[in-house]
Amino acid sequence: ALDTNYCFRNLEENCCVRPLYIDFRQDLGWKWVHEPKGYYANFCSGPCPYLRSADTTHSTVLGLYNTLNPEASASPCCVPQDLEPLTILYYVGRTPKVEQLSNMVVKSCKCS
Amino acid sequence: ALDTNYCFRNLEENCCVRPLYIDFRQDLGWKWVHEPKGYYANFCSGPCPYLRSADTTHSTVLGLYNTLNPEASASPCCVPQDLEPLTILYYVGRTPKVEQLSNMVVKSCKCS
């Protein structure tokens, strides 16, 4: 699987999950998030050669087409597969609130 | 929606579904498919600027991050959203068989 366990331990050029730290205030302008100050959102990048973690029949077909037609511009793209939530603390005035934000952290990638 | 109705009628540079005709024999080397000879598989391509048909919270966050940090290499990618099956005819010896291949045709795209 193209997950953090594999991708963070290997120098992988092809489609893999990459570490990306986002500071809420500096990078997003989100002043309302109190804690954490930032988090590892991660992202997916790298080429999708034929049969690499293909998501659907279409991505397999497109990968094969691309292999047999190297000049073609159509190829699968490396995108998130598994995402996890992030728990944050914010304030409503002086009252603290805890919220779970869904689909915030990329754990693995696929070729789609 | 970034679907064929919209994308095939507009000269859209950003993420959209593009027409792609695949000839089973010539492009894939699939001699076993008798009919059709080929089909419009289509594909997704184009930049994913901030807020364009974002798939998840993560892709919206990544798009916002990319907007506020233009030098960043992390950005969402244009990939298939809705896929449709394709019905094909093939032969097992002299016996014709009809099969529905799932997820063969891209109908719309998203930024993921």
Partner: antibody
Framework: QVQLVQSGAEVKKPGSSVKVSCKAS????????ISWVRQAPGQGLEWMGG????????NYAQRFKGRVTITADESTSTTYMELSSLRSEDTAVYYC?????????????WGQGTLVTVSS | ETVLTQSPGTLSLSPGERATLSCRAS???????LAWYQQKPGQAPRLLIY???SRAPGIPDRFSGSGSGTDFTLTISRLEPEDFAVYYC?????????FGQGTRLEIK
């Protein structure tokens, strides 16, 4: 700089609903927290609630809970305020405003206002 | 909810004079949860002061805010003709956000 453009005036019957839109220009829609404030003719300002785009966390004034829904559509950089079970005392100018960044905060940019008239 | 009481209800002054507007909260707001707005007829409110004493961008330095706890003041050091309007205080320490009933500043 944020610009907030609201939908046009509405005339509604008692018991019906109204949905007012507020479109933000500029690239930082999802960095803003949007509040809704109303002002009855000749009266003061009254906060109804607010929303954090992207994550769709909404907070409402208790007296409007169950009657008001505030949502955000990131794809169009638009926030909506829907008020149901309208009565004559809901006749007011409804404003959207972006806060300085917190859920409850001062409001630095305001829409032009939308007059909602409730009359039978 | 926190009730904000503004005084006076109406203030009649001449251009060039000093205006002092008061806002009293029914419970302590600390030192940084109060804002002041100016509103003219047919217009949306305009933020003047936030955090009790910080001027919003583009606001002339004749406007200043002070106070903490329950007592806050907006001072306009030297009134200009365009300053005659209605002024509201707003608290954002607790939900719901509340506004004072307003002080009308009129030309004497």
């Amino acid at each position: 700089q944020v610009q907030l453009v609201q939908s046009g005036a509405e005339v509604k019957k008692p018991g019906s609903s109204v949905k007012v839109s507020c479109k933000a220009s500029g690239n930082t829609f999802s960095s803003n927290v949007i509040s809704w404030v109303r002002q009855a003719p000749g009266q003061g300002l009254e906060w109804m609630g607010g929303v954090i785009p992207i994550v769709d966390i909404a907070n409402y004034a208790q007296r409007f809970k169950g009657r008001v829904t505030i949502t955000a559509d990131e794809s169009t950089s638009t926030t909506y305020m829907e008020l149901s079970s309208l009565r004559s005392e809901d006749t007011a100018v409804y404003y959207c405003a972006s806060t300085l960044g917190l859920v409850l905060d001062a409001m630095d940019y305001w829409g032009q206002g939308t007059l909602v008239t409730v009359s039978s | 909810e926190t009730v904000l009481t503004q005084s006076p209800g109406t203030l009649s002054l001449s251009p060039g004079e000093r205006a002092t507007l008061s806002c009293r909260a029914s419970q302590s707001l600390g030192s940084s949860y109060l804002a002041w707005y100016q509103q003219k007829p047919g217009q949306a409110p305009r933020l003047l002061i936030y955090g009790a004493s910080s001027r919003a961008p583009g606001i002339p330095d004749r406007f200043s805010g002070s106070g903490s706890g329950t007592d806050f003041t907006l001072t306009i050091s030297r009134l200009e003709p365009e300053d005659f309007a209605v002024y509201y205080c707003q608290q954002y320490a607790d939900s719901p956000i509340t506004f004072g009933q307003g002080t009308r500043l009129e030309i004497k």
